[in-house]
Interface confidence: low
């Protein structure tokens, strides 16, 4: 990733967008019937037009599946047309590669089947950045139970249910080895106000141990699963069980690597022609590149994760296509 | 760097007392457990005690424990551990150690150490 | 101690070499492994299931099976002659160590 740039301008052939995280669209996107800039400003302030049908632009103009232009006459195609910004919230990573995303915490999960011990879990987690999962409200709870966590067929434990360690214990504050005890957020730092409720004890406690970890189990049946249905396991922190990793949301990059705040980078997702900052994990002041269509190709793909390349579908054509607009950012 | 710099030990009586202290650099004190090791002339190494983070947390061997007390004081970033009743078997190198994990409750594993104290206890 | 190590083992500058450390309570609880050199404190080289601390070479491994926990080093150095204690939990939950393997580079 390159450093953080100085204020973006736009170019000549961009419309500049009023405020939101996109900057600058292509000029032909203006008033378009089509809203891109997020505060909707390239809409504003149009002539009336009538008894027109107006283009589609970008995303809606290649069908992917079939790589060739929809809505008839592939003359339809102006100069620049093909990458479009994207409305982050619905396309872009904000987790690398295998965490879930929740919006309500702006955090990011993973279960992750290995069996370790707690300790080492912790390790685990920590040195990913995170930590075992605590959990702030109910919501967040019913999230990580929806979740349909990846499921190798040789996993730790995986049955029908699956315990995960997760960011709490349970210490024994009873005489004479009764079970009562309170749960206590076992890393400090953790804030969350979620407490979990009195704990199953694991089958086989060892006398000298005053302190439990957290074991949270789901049960993966699709039926049960969605009626949160749960448990809380108070067990030896020695034992070995999967668990679950919480980290903040982030910005990650179209490869999958996580970018640092004040980072320029183009965003994981489904548009390589976007260029955006990395602000609170979340990309902003996005300008997008601009494609002029492949010459002398009817049926195109365009590269996934490549800006301005294109794959020529047709049977007598090149294979590559590089097609870069004058002044793109 | 992380560092840990022991003091206090020396010749002392059976039956009487004597105060180990380790005085830790290099890294959060208040945020990890920590721990007392002690390894006899020639023998293995025993786990004597452990701290939490806050200090809230005290857990000893049986060979120990009505005998010896662990307390940190934070804000001089420095472990103690006083040891009262003292007894020939006691005698011994005393190592103080950061436990590795972050946590209120330790995780036993020892990841830095301080480079040991000798306590000698002989009439 | 419930950690049983077995006291000398040797092994030829460049070989591999295996560390072994038994106990019931090793078929639940993973050990962690510690070398000491003469006159100085020990050092973590793998603790839990097979983690190894910043600092510590790749040669160093951690395995466990059954009531055994080993550790391997893979193209031994003169500088890892020393002596390796495994540590884990008791049945009783408590914390031992085995009474140590002196390891001799030839």
């Known amino acids: 990733t390159e450093p953080l740039r100085p204020e973006l301008r736009c170019n000549p052939g961009q419309f500049a967008c009023r405020s939101g995280t996109i900057q600058c669209i292509p000029l032909p996107w203006q008033c378009d019937g089509w809203a891109t800039c997020e505060d909707e400003s390239d809409e504003a302030n149009c002539p009336e037009v009538t008894g027109e049908v107006r283009p589609h632009h970008g995303k809606e103009a290649v069908d992917p599946r079939q790589g060739r232009a929809r809505g008839g006459d592939p003359s339809h195609f102006h100069a620049v047309n093909v990458a479009q910004p994207v409305r982050f919230s619905s396309f872009l990573g904000k987790c690398p590669t295998g965490w879930h995303h929740y919006e309500g915490t702006a955090s990011c999960y993973r279960v992750y089947l290995s069996g370790e011990n707690y300790w080492d879990a912790a390790q685990t987690c920590q040195r990913l950045n995170g930590s075992l999962a605590t959990f702030s409200t109910d919501q967040e709870l019913r999230f990580v139970l929806a979740q349909e966590w990846d499921q190798p067929e040789r996993s730790f434990g995986w049955k029908d249910q699956r315990k995960l360690w997760v960011g709490y214990q349970y210490v024994i504050t009873g005489r004479n080895r009764s079970l009562e005890g309170r749960w206590e957020v076992a890393f400090k730092g953790s804030s969350e106000v979620f407490l979990p409720p009195d704990p199953i004890f694991a089958s086989a406690m060892s006398e000298n141990d005053n302190v439990f970890c957290a074991q949270l189990q789901c049960f993966h049946f699709p039926t049960l699963r969605h009626h949160d249905l749960h448990s809380w396991h108070a067990e030896s922190c020695y034992e070995k069980s999967s668990f679950l990793c919480k980290r903040s949301q982030t910005c990650v990059d179209i490869k999958d690597n996580v970018v640092d705040e004040g980072f320029y980078f183009t965003p994981k997702g489904d548009d390589p022609c976007l260029s955006c900052t990395c602000h609170g994990g979340e990309p902003e002041m996005c300008v997008a590149a601009l494609c002029e269509r492949p010459q002398g190709c009817q049926q195109y793909r365009k590269d996934p994760k490549e800006c301005c390349k294109f794959m020529c579908l047709d049977p007598d054509g090149n294979s590559l296509f590089d097609s870069m607009a004058s002044g793109m950012r | 760097e992380v560092q840990l710099v022991q003091s206090g030990g020396g010749v002392v009586q059976p039956g009487r007392s004597l105060r180990l202290s380790c005085a830790a650099s290099g890294f959060t004190f208040s945020s990890y457990g920590m721990h007392w090791v002690r390894q006899a002339p020639g023998k293995g190494l025993e786990w004597v005690a452990v701290?939490?983070?806050?200090?809230?947390?005290?857990y000893y061997a049986d060979s120990v424990k009505g005998r010896f007390t662990i307390s940190r004081d934070n804000s001089k970033n420095t472990l103690y551990l006083q040891m009262n009743s003292l007894r020939a078997e006691d005698t011994a190198v005393y190592y103080c150690?950061?436990?590795?994990?972050?946590?209120?409750?330790?995780?036993?594993?020892?990841?830095?150490w301080g480079q040991g104290t000798l306590v000698t206890v002989s009439s | 101690s419930e950690l049983t190590q077995d006291p000398a083992v040797s092994v030829a500058l460049g070989r591999t070499v295996r560390i072994t450390c038994q106990g019931d309570?090793?078929?639940?609880?993973?050990a962690s492994w510690y070398q000491q050199k003469p006159g100085q404190a020990p050092v973590l080289v793998i603790y839990g299931k097979n983690n190894r601390p910043s600092g510590i070479p790749d040669r160093f491994s951690g395995s466990s099976s059954g009531n055994t926990a080993s550790l391997t080093i893979t193209g031994a150095q003169a500088e890892d002659e020393a002596d390796y204690y495994c540590?884990?939990?008791?049945?009783?939950?408590?914390?031992?160590f085995g009474g140590g393997t002196k390891l001799t580079v030839l």
């Open positions: 540590n884990s939990r008791d049945s009783s939950g408590n914390l031992v």
């Open positions: 309570s090793l078929r639940s609880y993973y």
């Open positions: 150690a950061k436990d590795l994990t972050r946590s209120g409750y330790p995780s036993y594993y020892f990841d830095y």
């Open positions: 701290i939490s983070y806050d200090g809230s947390n005290k």
